[in-house]
Interface confidence: low
Amino acid sequence: KKVVLGKKGDTVELTCTASQKKSIQFHWKNSNQIKILGNQGSFLTKGPSKLNDRADSRRSLWDQGNFPLIIKNLKIEDSDTYICEVEDQKEEVQLLVFGLTANSDTHLLQGQSLTLTLESPPGSSPSVQCRSPRGKNIQGGKTLSVSQLELQDSGTWTCTVLQNQKKVEFKIDIVVLAFQKASSIVYKKEGEQVEFSFPLAFTVEKLTGSGELWWQAERASSSKSWITFDLKNKEVSVKRVTQDPKLQMGKKLPLHLTLPQALPQYAGSGNLTLALEAKTGKLHQEVNLVVMRATQLQKNLTCEVWGPTSPKLMLSLKLENKEAKVSKREKAVWVLNPEAGMWQCLLSDSGQVLLESNIKVLPTWSTPVQP
């Protein structure tokens, strides 16, 4: 018996061939011997089966001795043995229809779980293997689960169902809702304007929700909400903003925040959360602000940084075009009785300069100039 696998919602064509290459009498029946369709001369006739409005044949092939049964918009319950009667012969074809669906919305938040459920006909024992867009394989029986979805899981999942040594392939498009970056860090000199950007890693027609930026300043004992906002069809509107600092927010995506001035008291870490309509859970992006200040007080030239720096970052003070006078893995360095000239304060990581601040030291009778 020939086995044919079909996909729920698809169209399948079951073949039936006569030895004579001409149009002759044929009938297709199901396992209950109920007639589905056949011919009367050159006319297509249909029986009382449940497939009535979904069954068809190709009249153009009858003259060649081919009498296919076409079933449209396949359903799991169409799984059956179909019998083609032609030339006093019976050809049997077993049709097995499978469906594969995501248990929830195909738009899922980063970190959530994806469950794929296989619908299969009774008595079948299929195996399923799915391959994620990043090449990860998962295998199982009636259900397959992937926990902790990552951004790279966005895209087309290719799932293959194996039954009776036959294969049928499903493609499911999954969108993982996340920010492009889990975390970012901004380095600024004191007084500079700070731009925070929170680009999303997905595009959808309509995007509605609400968000908030909580900030934990390094100098503060607790975190506080800096801004709350609404998102309606990709339009951003601010609901509430603190007076200090007075953040400004862009009206369009990507989410964009401006801090008028980088000040030591603002240095720290923030967490932007975005709750999307009809989704449980929230999207998160961490943002960090490091602020540098170079000052000269009396005979002491000092350079300081505030904010979340890693232990491997190096802070240096050097006179222009000379070797560093002081270099430490600390958040403050100083030079006593600095020579006159343009001094540079450098924050670097493995030789790469992240932040630079210049301060001009004048001869002792003058006051310092900060460009």
Partner: antibody
Framework: QVQLQESGPGLVKPSETLSLTCTVS????????WSWIRQPPGKGLEWIGY???????NYNPSLKSRVTISVDTSKNQLSLKLRSVTAADTAVYYC?????????????WGQGTTVTVSS | DIQMTQSPSSLSASVGDRVTITCQAS??????LNWYQQKPGKAPKLLIY???NLETGVPSRFSGSGSGTDFTFAISSLQPEDIATYYC?????????FGGGTKVEIK
């Protein structure tokens, strides 16, 4: 780190049944196919068959009448039985984790066990 | 059964040479092809899956290409540790079948 270890008698008499066990450690037997492959001395690789953890099996038609592969998920083991052996069944027998039918390949193998069929 | 024909059956090349092995399937197998390396006395090791995808941890000097019936496996710069027999394997259809193998030696 998943590891596979084949075990069983190294010598089997002609017409008897060859029985081998493959123990899976460092991971679950679930959600994979588990294949048996053999390699006669100085020759190439021949696939014997596989079992899915759910119990679904597929065998090489050339051996189908003589082979049975089974799985014990509680012990994380699979076994191979090959009946009515002859000298032609002398080979190194490997078990391997098979990613399946749509992609992947056999990515984890046991070190193999040598079986000699001789009276 | 699908027959897999590998050629050459053996080859000898110098360290640093580019080495190529071909594998031909008796029917269209799309990209359902794997390549394995087997060193003497050891189990085979998966190098390439889906005809061209490098298995995790496998050096980038190994590569695979092809689709349908004709496939190629290459080592861009042969190293002493690459002395082994290489096998192709199809999994488009059961039974799974292997090529006869190509023994690679150093000149």
């Amino acid at each position: 780190q998943v590891q596979l270890q084949e075990s069983g008698p190294g010598l089997v008499k002609p017409s008897e049944t060859l029985s081998l066990t493959c123990t899976v450690s460092g991971g679950s037997i679930s959600h994979y196919y588990w294949s048996w492959i053999r390699q006669p001395p100085g020759k190439g690789l021949e696939w014997i068959g596989y079992i899915h953890y759910s119990g679904t099996t597929n065998y090489n038609p050339s051996l189908k009448s003589r082979v049975t592969i089974s799985v014990d998920t509680s012990k994380n083991q699979l076994s191979l039985k090959l009946r009515s052996v002859t000298a032609a069944d002398t080979a190194v027998y490997y078990c391997a984790r098979d990613q399946g039918f749509s992609s992947g390949g056999m990515d984890v193998w046991g070190q193999g066990t040598t079986v000699t069929v001789s009276s | 059964d699908i027959q897999m024909t590998q050629s050459p059956s053996s080859l000898s090349a110098s360290v640093g040479d580019r080495v190529t092995i071909t594998c031909q399937a008796s029917q269209d197998i799309s990209n359902y092809l794997n390549w394995y390396q087997q060193k003497p006395g050891k189990a085979p090791k998966l190098l390439i899956y889906d005809a061209s995808n490098l298995e995790t941890g496998v050096p980038s000097r190994f590569s695979g290409s092809g689709s349908g019936t004709d496939f190629t496996f290459a080592i861009s710069s042969l190293q002493p540790e690459d002395i082994a027999t290489y096998y192709c394997q199809q999994y488009d259809n059961l039974p799974l079948t292997f090529g006869g193998g190509t023994k690679v030696e150093i000149k």
